[in-house]
């Protein structure tokens, strides 16, 4: 296993609709044709895996049915949204990028993105 | 159709080490989550981890010093090791399918279940 | 990690009763799962997102509830439903479970 560096921002603010984008990029050191990106998210020293997407180079990312994520690719770049985010869900999302194919096998984790959510506040009533 | 079986030793000694397989079929590993969960006798259900379609794994914090669970997706196989057991670790083993994630838009069950496995810690 | 306490612990019903089986949660949680077990048997999914009913479960058994406070409801006990009923939150991990609630025969 290589080590493969990646960036991602440090911080992003979610939408008033819970949905976040951030991009994350990777050197890759050679011409790979298969990539895997998972997205992690760490809070209260607990990592979960929020989603993960395996494409081939120059094809579009698909994530799993019922997955709260889209993505994008372009080059070394992945351009990725999560929807239906509350403020439950803020926390430090981490970009994993592996290079599966063809050998060797490289392997690089971000330094995470702050997503913060915030809850809409509710619609006051009218007296209409 | 799906299915999940355990198998492994059902008597382990005192701080060896747990070995359980759960095999699947009718599913991918790399599109669902498998979930262990144990049953000590004539007592509740503990979760006690998952390895999620992308090959993260999380613990309960309880065991996480003792527990790893990994799955070979080419053999449709998860694996869970459990080390320095002790007899409160006597239980009913079972591996279930669940969400591929921790976050998702539905579909939040572990909807098929293996039919566990006995494991008793005695020396 | 969050907490789940089931009530009652055990319940006595007769056949065409019907029962309620309350959860509640130490914070607020999403997801509730209900789960059927029956002696020597692995648990059995009868809700999934606190509300769905799982495929092949009658429609008698039905789940609600939102914030911390969630119900199972079985409107009328049929002699097979006799078995043990458990929650499971999906908001935090760890997974956890209520205590369990046995369903007995009156």
């Known amino acids: 296993c290589k080590a493969m560096h990646v960036a991602q921002p440090a911080v992003v603010l979610a939408s008033s609709r819970g949905i976040a984008s951030f991009v994350c990029e990777y050197a890759s050191p050679g011409k790979a044709t298969e990539v895997r990106v998972t997205v992690l998210r760490q809070a209260d020293s607990q990592v979960t895996e929020v989603c993960a997407a395996t494409y081939m180079m120059g094809n579009e990312l698909t994530f799993l049915d019922d997955s709260i994520c889209t993505g994008t690719s372009s080059g070394n770049q992945v351009n990725l949204t999560i929807q239906g985010l509350r403020a439950m869900d803020t926390g430090l999302y981490i970009c994993k990028v592996e290079l599966m194919y063809p050998p060797p096998y490289y392997l690089g984790i971000g330094n995470g993105t702050q997503i913060y959510v915030i809850d809409p506040e509710p619609c006051p009533d009218s007296d209409f | 159709q799906v299915q999940l079986q355990e198998s492994g030793p059902g008597l382990v000694k005192p701080s060896q080490t747990l070995s359980l397989t759960c095999t699947v079929s009718?599913?991918?590993?790399?599109?669902?989550?498998v979930y262990w969960v144990r049953q000590p006798p004539g007592k509740g259900l503990e979760w006690l981890g998952v390895i999620w379609a992308g090959g993260t794994t999380n613990y309960n914090s309880a065991l996480m010093s003792r527990l790893t669970i990994s799955k070979d997706t080419s053999k449709n196989q998860v694996s869970l090791k459990l080390s320095s057991v002790t007899a409160a670790d006597t239980a009913v083993y079972y591996c279930a399918r669940g969400p591929p994630h921790a976050m998702m838009k539905r579909g939040y069950a572990m909807d098929y279940w293996g039919q566990g496995t006995l494991v008793t810690v005695s020396s | 990690d969050i907490q789940m306490t089931q009530s009652p612990s055990s319940l006595s019903a007769s056949v065409g009763d019907r029962v309620t089986i309350t959860c509640s949660a130490t914070s607020s949680i999403t997801y509730m799962s209900w789960y059927q077990q029956k002696p020597g048997k692995a648990p059995k999914l009868l809700i999934y997102d606190t509300s769905n009913l799982a495929s092949g479960v009658p429609s008698r058994f039905s789940g609600s509830g939102s914030g911390t406070d969630y119900t199972l409801t079985i409107s009328s006990l049929q002699p097979e439903d006799f078995a043990t009923y458990y929650c499971?939150?999906?908001?935090?991990?760890?997974?956890?479970f209520g205590g369990g609630t046995k369903l007995e025969i009156k």
């Open positions: 009718g599913f991918s590993l790399t599109s669902y989550g």
């Open positions: 499971q939150q999906w908001s935090s991990y760890p997974l956890t």
